[in-house]
């Protein structure tokens, strides 16, 4: 064939707005506008059309769009023509999205959820991968089992605890303390037959620079578990925090630059400046992670005038602990995340 598509996820094809093969022209000059502008439904922007002629109600997410019927810029939408190449006449309004991700040599689209293995479910958000464990974390047995250890069982994905007794014969542990993930989720009455659950945020997917963390929550009308994401930046990659540790000290728990700054994402800049706190570093083998944090909403403005907002981790305080793994292993932290309820806030 004359065209060879690469073996990646195919772009969607828009529903036909009309037969564009016979009449591909959408803008007409001179402009022909109705005597009065249309009245738009609640929440739909009244904008100038793409021909820069008339007022129109902006097309919404999933609507067809053309050079004339443009997507709602106030909702961060753009016209995705990828289903109509090479004509680029009719597209579909899509969300302005960030960067795709590469994990273990595999490329994932922004927003795409995937399972790199049986233990984790991951999501690509603006260039960073965030994962949540699929194996329910059962606490190790206590008291009656002096030497618990986790072992892989053939045919099973998730490791299980076994108890090494005095006879050194491993046996499966009794099903005690098998209630939840490592960190306890918020449980409250939501509506009949629904117990609301929000998992803690997963660790940031990168040890420095922009990353993502995710959590599962069923606090919605359908009581259906959904994955939420937020951007995170534990510490800048381009600052050597080791040099800031005072003489005689082994750690710097929190690092805060003197100047305020704007966040940048996919070429877009935050609409206001911030003075964030970052987690520091230690001279020994300890690693510093947030233990008091919250989630803030950051609005971004793009060069073409479009805007969008993202949830972002805001660090208030960090602590340095001994449970450190390879910072480049995005799954390592998920194995042993500390049981601090503040992290989920």
């Amino acid at each position: 064939t004359a065209l060879s598509p690469a073996p990646t996820t195919m772009d969607f094809t828009p529903a036909p707005l009309e037969d564009t093969s016979s009449r591909p022209q959408f803008c007409k000059w001179p402009c022909e506008c109705p005597p009065s502008p249309p009245r738009c439904p609640l929440g739909v922007s009244l904008i100038t059309d793409g021909c820069e002629c008339c007022k129109m109600c902006a097309q919404q997410l999933g609507d067809n769009c053309t050079e004339a019927a443009i997507c709602d810029p106030h909702r961060g939408l753009y016209c995705d023509y990828s289903g109509d190449r090479p004509r680029y006449a009719i597209g579909v309004c899509a969300q302005v999205v960030g960067v795709g991700c590469v994990l273990d040599g595999v490329r994932y689209n922004n927003g795409q959820s995937f399972q790199p293995n049986c233990k984790y479910n991951c999501t690509c958000i603006d260039g960073a991968v965030g994962c949540t464990p699929l194996c329910l974390r059962v606490r190790p047995p206590r008291l009656w089992c002096p030497h618990p250890r986790r072992v892989s069982i053939p045919g099973h994905c998730c490791e299980q605890w076994v108890c090494e007794d005095d006879a050194k014969r491993p046996r499966k542990t009794a099903p005690r303390d098998t209630g939840a993930f490592d960190a306890v989720g918020e449980v409250e009455a939501w509506h009949r037959n629904c117990i609301a659950y929000t998992s803690p945020w997963s660790p940031c997917s990168t040890s420095c620079g922009l990353g993502v963390s995710t959590r599962i929550s069923n606090v919605n009308a359908q009581c259906w578990p959904e994955q939420e994401s937020r951007l995170c930046n534990l510490r800048p990659c381009d600052v050597d925090i080791h040099t800031l540790i005072k003489a005689g000290k082994k750690c710097l728990a929190v690092y805060q630059p003197e100047a305020s700054m704007n966040f940048t994402l996919a070429g877009c800049i935050s609409t206001r400046s911030y003075q964030p706190k970052y987690c520091g570093v230690c001279m020994d083998n300890r690693c510093c992670i947030p233990y008091k944090s919250k989630t803030i909403d950051v609005s971004f403005q793009c060069p073409d005038g479009l805007g969008f907002s993202r949830q972002v981790l805001w660090i208030n305080a960090c602590f340095c602990n001994l449970s450190c793994r390879n910072p480049n292993d995005i799954f390592a932290d998920l194995e042993s995340y500390p049981d601090f309820s503040e992290i989920a806030n």
Partner: antibody, heavy 117, light 107 residues
Framework: EVQLVQSGADVKKPGASVKVSCQAS????????IHWMRQAPGQGLEWMGW????????GYAEKFQGRVAMTSHTSTSTVYMELSRLTSEDTAVYYC??????????WGQGTLVTVSS | DIQMTQSPSSVSASVGDRVTITCRAS??????LAWYQQKPGKAPKLLIY???TLQSGVPSRFSGSGSGTDFTLTISSLQPEDFATYYC?????????FGQGTRLEIK
Amino acid sequence: EVQLVQSGADVKKPGASVKVSCQASGYTLTSYDIHWMRQAPGQGLEWMGWINPNSGNTGYAEKFQGRVAMTSHTSTSTVYMELSRLTSEDTAVYYCARGAMGGFDPWGQGTLVTVSS
Amino acid sequence: DIQMTQSPSSVSASVGDRVTITCRASQDISRWLAWYQQKPGKAPKLLIYAASTLQSGVPSRFSGSGSGTDFTLTISSLQPEDFATYYCQQANTFPITFGQGTRLEIK
């Protein structure tokens, strides 16, 4: 103003590879496909392929299949075209252009690639 | 692949003249044709898309017509800055193909 700015001229030896960059400004890179064309000295325009910077999907003209790779780096609003196993016949000005309704607009200023031993 | 054939390959004309360039596709491309102007050492510039729609900022002396397989680009009154090479391009199907070009020279 919507603009595409390409990297500077390059001289390569036969058998080598060349990587040309194309940086977009004035719009969100992920909203449009980028196409690559080339023009040999005194010759017409030849289409090479496209890339969707949002999905990473690509499509190449059969002539270049296996020898061309188009990639994108959305955080820097840059698209790249790499052509390998160069011969003297690959000496040309290489252009990137944004896919628009029924045509290409705008175009980059062009990058002259000279293949000479 | 769709072949695009332009005629003439070159034309000489004077300022103020009306000039017509034709482009023929080897198969039906509906109205999916674009016209470009290219000056020496410069990148092509989109003049007309969808056979007859004038690109924003292009002078109205340029016009396009046709559908199916036969298309024309007309410059109603040549200006000094119009002397250049003109290309047609089909945007109906992949692979995208261009005409070989028409060089417009000063008489």
